[in-house]
Amino acid sequence: PTSSSTKKTQLQLEHLLLDLQMILNGINNYKNPKLTRMLTFKFYMPKKATELKHLQCLEEELKPLEEVLNLAQSKNFHLRPRDLISNINVIVLELKGSETTFMCEYADETATIVEFLNRWITFSQSIISTLT
């Protein structure tokens, strides 16, 4: 990667981070009456998530994420869940590259939507701070 492509990657990661934080804030909104119900849904967590290729694990969970977000009141988000997830999907596909043979491995334990989002927020923050 060139310095310009790395800069683009950084910007994409910042967009991904903002999108994930927006979803988390929308879910945690005290006016969200569906939070208890949303927390019953389980998400697969990556066995490891330190590099861009591990975004394969996030990509595979975007559809379930969209389904859970459809439960929330739309006013909690600036965009419809379908559009929000579509935006994230475009970023993820660009970031992880076209290494289609790379298979995700998941941790043994599942997580709530809040734990899931926090994991990928932590991932985004760490890549932003260490990518050179």
Epitope: M45, K47, L52, K53, A107, D108, I127
Partner: antibody, heavy 117, light 107 residues
């Protein structure tokens, strides 16, 4: 058998440069993330840099802007270009393979870098 | 950055003893923890990954446990070749960080 063999260490003056190499064999080099980890005399281990299979590079604040990790998949080789060296960079530098889903599973024997005037 | 606090920093024990080394992460790292053994003048050797799984060839007397922030490495019956320094490491997120090490000495 997985093997990692480092070379290129030596004595260098503060402000100087050095290029470390790591020759890998026994696995599909291009599919793995590789890392450099260092150990100052009598001290613990410190992660220095990593490069993934797409050649994206990662490093901590302590060396960013001074150290550059790179790889040559055709030669099964990993490199660490170290510039603006300081006394505190004195250490044994290890090359390690980062398994895709787990820890640093194989390590080289290390190469010693001494920064002193 | 995630801090890994290892204790004790040194430990004296005898052959046949059961020894436990602990590692505490400054934040949740799931089970993304590895343990390494390093003998004087040698490079680190990977013992444990995912907090509790032994690498191939690692004797069964070595075991790891824990998740979240608290982790342990146990050697059930010390052998002469086990006297070395042991390090924990988190690989939950970059930058990878290691514990300060535990030097296991012969009593």
């Amino acid at each position: 058998e997985v093997q990692l063999v480092e070379s290129g260490g030596g004595l260098v003056q503060p402000g100087g440069s050095l290029r470390l190499s790591c020759a890998a064999s026994g696995f599909t080099f291009s599919s793995y993330t590789l890392a450099w980890v260092r150990q100052a005399p009598g001290k613990g281990l410190e992660w220095v840099a990593a490069i993934d299979s797409s050649s994206y590079t990662y490093s901590p604040d302590t060396v960013r802007g001074r150290f550059t990790i790179s790889r040559d998949n055709a030669k099964n080789s990993l490199y660490l270009q170290m510039n603006s060296l300081r006394a505190e960079d004195t250490a044994v530098y290890y090359c390690a393979r980062d398994s895709n889903w787990d820890a640093l599973d194989y390590w080289g024997q290390g190469t010693t870098v001494t920064v002193s005037s | 950055d995630i801090q890994m606090t290892q204790s004790p920093s040194s430990l004296s024990a005898s052959v046949g003893d059961r020894v436990t080394i602990t590692c505490k992460a400054s934040q949740n790292v799931g089970t993304n923890v590895g343990w390494y053994q390093q003998k004087p003048g040698q490079s680190p050797k990977a013992l444990i990954y995912s907090a509790s799984f032994r690498y191939s060839g690692v004797p069964s007397r070595f075991s790891g446990s824990g998740s979240g922030t608290d982790f342990t490495l146990t050697i059930s019956s010390l052998q002469p070749e086990d006297f070395a320094t042991y390090y924990c490491q988190q690989y939950y997120t970059y930058p990878y960080t290691f514990g300060g090490g535990t030097k296991l000495e012969i009593k």
